[in-house]
Structures are given as structure tokens and as C-alpha cells.
């Protein structure tokens, strides 16, 4: 025969009752036992598992004067705000000497109006763009049938006949409200009403129309905006270093963008006050009375180079016999691009102007032909970029060299085609 032959005489004289109710109900389960000697601690089980966090109270009443007399022990388990997780079989458990005893079971059940596990949420959608809404409810009692409503109008003839947990909306052209009703044998519960706000679609085809060193003209194609006309579009431009790398889908620029608003139509805007020869990223969003569209992806653009905005500075020209020494400094005004070099113009009183490309050097020694008797020599210098020459300096007359002045020794460049002077290589 199997091991274990002790007769189990249960100490329980009162077992937990049954509770059935709707969510949120508060109830108490009670069990009572009579034991001889020291009263044991009463534990509660739900579906055979000891409840670690039970809201229980235990009362002990002696039936005699002696500790070894009988005791009545009452344990009460309070269930506050009944939930589905509270349902199941409840028992009391005691360990007495070498015996484990459990009471007869009581049952906690849930029955009432449907309870929403998931309700439709407020959201924004682009005009004419498909989306899904979710709704989920449970009993008991089951089954629970759902009925979707759009702007308070049912989307099916009866509960359970239309879409259930997920409603697919192919697109909206106006802001609408959605809710769902949950029906079971106990009645109907209505979900929250979700507002679906229809925003303009993201603009398309953002592109450059024209470029100037300090301005860019851009255009785009607006997206659909439903029944709500666009009120304006917003363009953002942000400086982008070579290594910065705004990713195509990056939500925010790394620094404060330059923001401009455009009345629409036309869907075009001239962005000014930009830096020449500078990479930017631009994006656009359009707004209706319902709110803004999503931004387009960042589009990389670049302003072209401009010419230097000022002439070279501190030009000095000195003459010593048949040599002329000219030197200058880089313009203080913005170069608007990459400095490629300097041009020098030389002219005497009765001689034609001669142009020279000096390259990036900021000084030159000119070897004058003959005895250097050309009178009233003047020199002008201009800086240039790939976009062209900047403004020329005012003519600087050649001054006679005075003893004590430093005479720079420079590499000389010979240009045989010039009639008045040459650039001999030393």
C-alpha cells in the first residue's frame, strides 16, 4: 500500500465562502479553525500557491484558561478592488505539528460589464494615409463583442459583425473621432473617444531653384491636407560641417536652425543671409489649421563661392633703381570662398595697364626694363576666388627707396610678354 496512512482530521471548522462580483468590488474571505495548544499562523492559497502579499488578519481567542486548551483562530483575507487576477480557488493553509492542512476551497469570480484592456488612442495622421486603431475588452462573462463608431456613427450593423480588435482606416480627409463599444451578457461599456487629427502630408520633392553666395532659392511640392487648406510652410536651414553628417532620418538638427516661413502658394522661398561657399542641410514642413506636417528629410545643399568683398590690405610699393618691391596683406573683408591668389595691375603715366597673376604670394619684386625712367608708376592689387576677382585696391604710387629701409630679397618671376618690366628667375 502507498506510504502515508495517518488519518487527517482537519482543524478547520469554517471554510472560505464564494465571492462573485464586478471589477472594483471589495470583499472578504474568512476561515476558522479550532486547535489545541499554541495557535498556528494561517496562510492563504490562491490556486494552490501561497499568497506572498496577502492583506490578511488573524484573530485568536482562547477557549480556556490554560495555554494547552483549545483556541479558535479566525483568518480574514480582504480583497480590495476585485480584478481578474484575483479570481480563482482560495484556501487556508496551516502547518500543525507534522501535518499540513488546507481548508475546503472558496471561489472568487468576476462577472460584470466588459472591461477594456486596450482603448483607441488619440493620434495624428497624415491626410489620406491608412492607419489602424486598437480596442480590446474582456468579461467575464464572455463572449465580448465589439462595435466601432466613427464620429458617433456605428461602422457595422451589429456588435461582433464588423472589425473587432483592430480597425483599419484607409485614410481620412478631416479630423474625426473613433470609439468602440464592448457588449456582453451584462451590458455595454463604451471606450474613451479617440480624436484622430488630420495633418498635411509631408511635402515632396524639396529642391534648389537657384543659388547665390548668400542666398538659396528652394521649392517643393505640397502634400494633400484634406479639407484644411495649408496656411504656411516652414523651412529650416542648418550649417553642416563636413564631418557633422545629419542622417536622412535624424529628427533634430545638431544646432539651432535658421527658420523661415513661406506664405503659400507659391511653394517657393528665398533663404537669405547665408554664408557663401558653405554646406547646409534644409528641410520643410507645411501647416494647416490642424497642425504641421512631418518634416521632409534633410536635404544637403551648398551656397556657391563669391568673390572677395574687399581688396588686399596694407599695400606698399617701393622703387630702387630698376627694381620695384610690392607687398600686401590678405583682405580683412570676407573672402566668400577659397582664396586662389592675387592679381596685380601696373600702370605708368603714358603706358598701358599690365595685369599679373601673382599666385598666393603676398609680395613680389618687379625688375623694371631700361633705366626705370617710367614716371608716375602705380600698382593695384586684387584677391580672387573661383568665383572671380574681388575689388581692386586704390592705386598705390611707387615710392623711391630710402637708405635705411629694409630691402626684401624675393624670388622674382619673369614674364617675357610684359613690355615695361620682366619677372626674371634668380
Amino acid at each position: 500500500a502507498p506510504r502515508g496512512t495517518q488519518a487527517e482530521e482537519s482543524p478547520f471548522v469554517g471554510n472560505p465562502g464564494n465571492i462573485t462580483g464586478a471589477r472594483g468590488l471589495t470583499g472578504t474571505l474568512r476561515c476558522q479553525l479550532q486547535v489545541q495548544g499554541e495557535p498556528p499562523e494561517v496562510h492563504w492559497l490562491r490556486d494552490g500557491q501561497i499568497l506572498e502579499l496577502a492583506d490578511s488578519t488573524q484573530t485568536q481567542v482562547p477557549l480556556g484558561e490554560d495555554e494547552q486548551d483549545d483556541w479558535i483562530v479566525v483568518s480574514q483575507l480582504r480583497i480590495t478592488s476585485l480584478q481578474l487576477s484575483d479570481t480563482g480557488q482560495y484556501q487556508c493553509l496551516v502547518f500543525l505539528g507534522h501535518q499540513t492542512f488546507v481548508s475546503q476551497p472558496g471561489y472568487v469570480g468576476l462577472e460584470g460589464l466588459p472591461y477594456f484592456l486596450e482603448e483607441p488612442e488619440d493620434r495624428t495622421v497624415a491626410a489620406n494615409t491608412p492607419f489602424n486603431l486598437s480596442c480590446q475588452a474582456q468579461g467575464p462573462p464572455e463572449p465580448v463583442d465589439l462595435l466601432w463608431l466613427q464620429d458617433a456613427v456605428p461602422l457595422a450593423t451589429a456588435p461582433g459583425h464588423g472589425p473587432q480588435r483592430s480597425l483599419h482606416v484607409p485614410g481620412l480627409n478631416k479630423t474625426s473621432s473613433f470609439s468602440c463599444e464592448a457588449h456582453n451578457a451584462k451590458g455595454v461599456t463604451t471606450s474613451r473617444t479617440a480624436t484622430i487629427t488630420v495633418l498635411p502630408q509631408q511635402p515632396r520633392n524639396l529642391h534648389l531653384v537657384s543659388r547665390q553666395p548668400t542666398e538659396l532659392e528652394v521649392a517643393w511640392t505640397p502634400g494633400l491636407s484634406g479639407i484644411y487648406p495649408l496656411t504656411h510652410c516652414t523651412l529650416q536651414a542648418v550649417l553642416s560641417d563636413d564631418g557633422m553628417g545629419i542622417q536622412a532620418g535624424e529628427p533634430d538638427p545638431p544646432e539651432e536652425p535658421l527658420t523661415s516661413q513661406a506664405s503659400v502658394p507659391p511653394h517657393q522661398l528665398r533663404l537669405g543671409s547665408l554664408h557663401p561657399h558653405t554646406p547646409y542641410h534644409i528641410r520643410v514642413a507645411c501647416t494647416s489649421s490642424q497642425g504641421p506636417s512631418s518634416w521632409t528629410h534633410w536635404l544637403p545643399v551648398e551656397t556657391p563661392e563669391g568673390v572677395p568683398l574687399g581688396p588686399p590690405e596694407n599695400i606698399s610699393a617701393t622703387r630702387n633703381g630698376s627694381q620695384a618691391f610690392v607687398h600686401w596683406q590678405e583682405p580683412r573683408a570676407p573672402l566668400q570662398g577659397t582664396l586662389l591668389g592675387y592679381r596685380l595691375a601696373y600702370q605708368g603715366q603714358d603706358t598701358p595697364e599690365v595685369l599679373m597673376d601673382i599666385g598666393l604670394r603676398q609680395e613680389v619684386t618687379l625688375e623694371l626694363q631700361g633705366d626705370g625712367s617710367v614716371s608716375n608708376l602705380t600698382v593695384c592689387v586684387a584677391a580672387y576666388t573661383a568665383a572671380g576677382d574681388g575689388p581692386w585696391s586704390l592705386p598705390v604710387p611707387l615710392e623711391a627707396w630710402r637708405p635705411g629701409q629694409a630691402q626684401p630679397v624675393h624670388q622674382l618671376v619673369k614674364e617675357p610678354s610684359t613690355p615695361a618690366f620682366s619677372w626674371p628667375w634668380w
Epitope: P2, R3, G4, Q6, E8, E41, H43, L45, D47, G48, I50, L51, E52, L53, A54, G88, Q89, Q91, L93, F95, H98, Q99, T100, V102, S103, Q104, P105
Partner: antibody, heavy 118, light 112 residues
Framework: QVQLQQPGAELVKPGASVKLSCKAS????????INWVKQRPGQGLEWIGN????????NYNEKFKSKATLTVDKSSTTAYIQFSSLTSEDSAVYYC???????????WGQGTTLTVSS | DIVMSQSPSSLAVSAGEKVTMSCKSS????????????LAWYQQKPGQSPKLLIY???TRQSGVPDRFTGSGSGTDFTLTISSVQAEDLAVYYC????????FGGGTKLEIK
């Protein structure tokens, strides 16, 4: 008095299925978990899983999840373990035992010797 | 999953000698609600079902001789037989029931 009665032996062919029983008496069947334990010849004890008769809630040792299925029949106060696609590795003694929430006493059936052989 | 490790796997002693065997769990077996340690020791003699000796780590089952003592807390547990008798020839298993059940691999006790 508490008793767990198991048949002494079962002989089945490889690839077949078998359902072993454990008849409980002498206590409130729905109030205690029934555990199943495997012991291969000359080997140790391995817990297979358990079932709570009132709700038929089950827990399984991951190793036996695809091999064993636990059920109960409350009307006959009997617990069952069913094995599928039997192989020689399933040859063992299978015990049913009543859980006592870590306390005492605990009651074991005498075990069923399952032999899988062609 | 809780892992139970027993040592040694076997040992041989003479009648009258004291013997100890060890069981280690991979996590604590103390239940904060019931304040009990969910560790039991079983004795299994050849051809028999396992028999409960000790529960709650140190409580001797009714009818078990007092030469059997369980001790330990947290994760390290010991079964001691103070004076081994010939009828103690068996395999001894520890079992956790803190979270489902897991048995140790067993310690085989042989009498010289």
C-alpha cells in the same frame, strides 16, 4: 487515510503513446497539487511537472514539456500523465506524489514501471 | 531554475560511525512569507519509494529516528547521521520546493 494508487507496470512499443494513472483517495483531491517524478534504473529522481486538480493549472520541467502531458479527472479523483513518441529513454519508474506546500507528511504512490520495448 | 548539488556522490562507513552529506542550492530557499526554508531530505532504499526524513531544512518527520539531523540555512545544507545503522543503507536525496521542485543528484550510503 490518504492513498495514491498506481498500476505496477506498463509495457509499450517504441513510438507509441501511453497514459499512466494515479488514483487519489482519503483527502480533498482538488486542494493539493499532484507532482510526477521519474526515476530511471540506477539513476536519481527527476521532477517532471505538477497539476492543480481544481483548475488544471500545470507546471512542467522544460526537459519534459514536449514529452509529457498532465491531466486530471475530478469526478474519479484521478491524475494522469501521458507520454508520446516513446523511446527506450522513457523506460523508468514514474511516481505520483501529493504536494504539501513544503511541509509534511508527503504521500507517494508506489510507482509505475514503464518499459518501452519492441 | 534552481540547481541542487549534492556531495559526495557515494560514501562507505562502518556501523556506528557518524556521517555527513552536503547539499547546495543555487539560490536561497527561504520564503519570506512563511519564514520557512523549503528544503527536504529523502531516503530511498532499494526497490522502495522515497521516504521523507527532514522538511523545512531541519524539522524531522514524525517517526524518523533522532540520529537523523538536518541543518543549514540560505544555500548550504547538511544531513547528519550520528551513528549509522545497517538499515540506513540507501540513497539520500535533497529536494527544493521553494520554486516548483528540483532534486539533488543523490548520495549513496554503503555500509562497510
Amino acid at each position: 487515510q490518504v492513498q495514491l494508487q498506481q498500476p505496477g507496470a506498463e509495457l509499450v512499443k517504441p513510438g507509441a503513446s501511453v497514459k499512466l494513472s494515479c488514483k487519489a483517495s482519503g483527502y480533498t483531491f482538488t486542494s493539493y497539487w499532484i507532482n510526477w517524478v521519474k526515476q530511471r534504473p540506477g539513476q536519481g529522481l527527476e521532477w517532471i511537472g505538477n497539476i492543480y486538480p481544481d483548475s488544471s493549472s500545470t507546471n512542467y520541467n522544460e526537459k519534459f514539456k514536449s514529452k509529457a502531458t498532465l491531466t486530471v479527472d475530478k469526478s474519479s479523483t484521478t491524475a494522469y500523465i501521458q507520454f508520446s513518441s516513446l523511446t527506450s529513454e522513457d523506460s523508468a519508474v514514474y511516481y505520483c506524489t501529493r504536494d504539501t506546500y513544503g511541509g509534511s507528511p508527503d504521500y507517494w504512490g508506489q510507482g509505475t514501471t514503464l518499459t518501452v520495448s519492441s | 531554475d534552481i540547481v541542487m548539488s549534492q556531495s559526495p556522490s557515494s560514501l562507505a562507513v562502518s556501523a556506528g560511525e557518524k556521517v555527513t552529506m552536503s547539499c547546495k542550492s543555487s539560490q536561497s530557499l527561504l520564503n519570506s512569507r512563511t519564514r520557512k526554508i523549503y528544503l527536504a531530505w529523502y531516503q530511498q532504499k532499494p526497490g522502495q519509494s522515497p521516504k521523507l526524513l527532514i522538511y523545512w531544512a531541519s524539522t524531522r518527520q514524525s517517526g524518523v529516528p533522532d540520529r537523523f539531523t538536518g541543518s543549514g540555512s540560505g544555500t548550504d545544507f547538511t544531513l547528519t547521521i550520528s551513528s549509522v545503522q545497517a538499515e540506513d543503507l540507501a540513497v539520500y536525496y535533497c529536494k527544493q520546493s521553494y520554486n516548483l521542485w528540483t532534486f539533488g543528484g543523490g548520495t549513496k550510503l554503503e555500509i562497510k
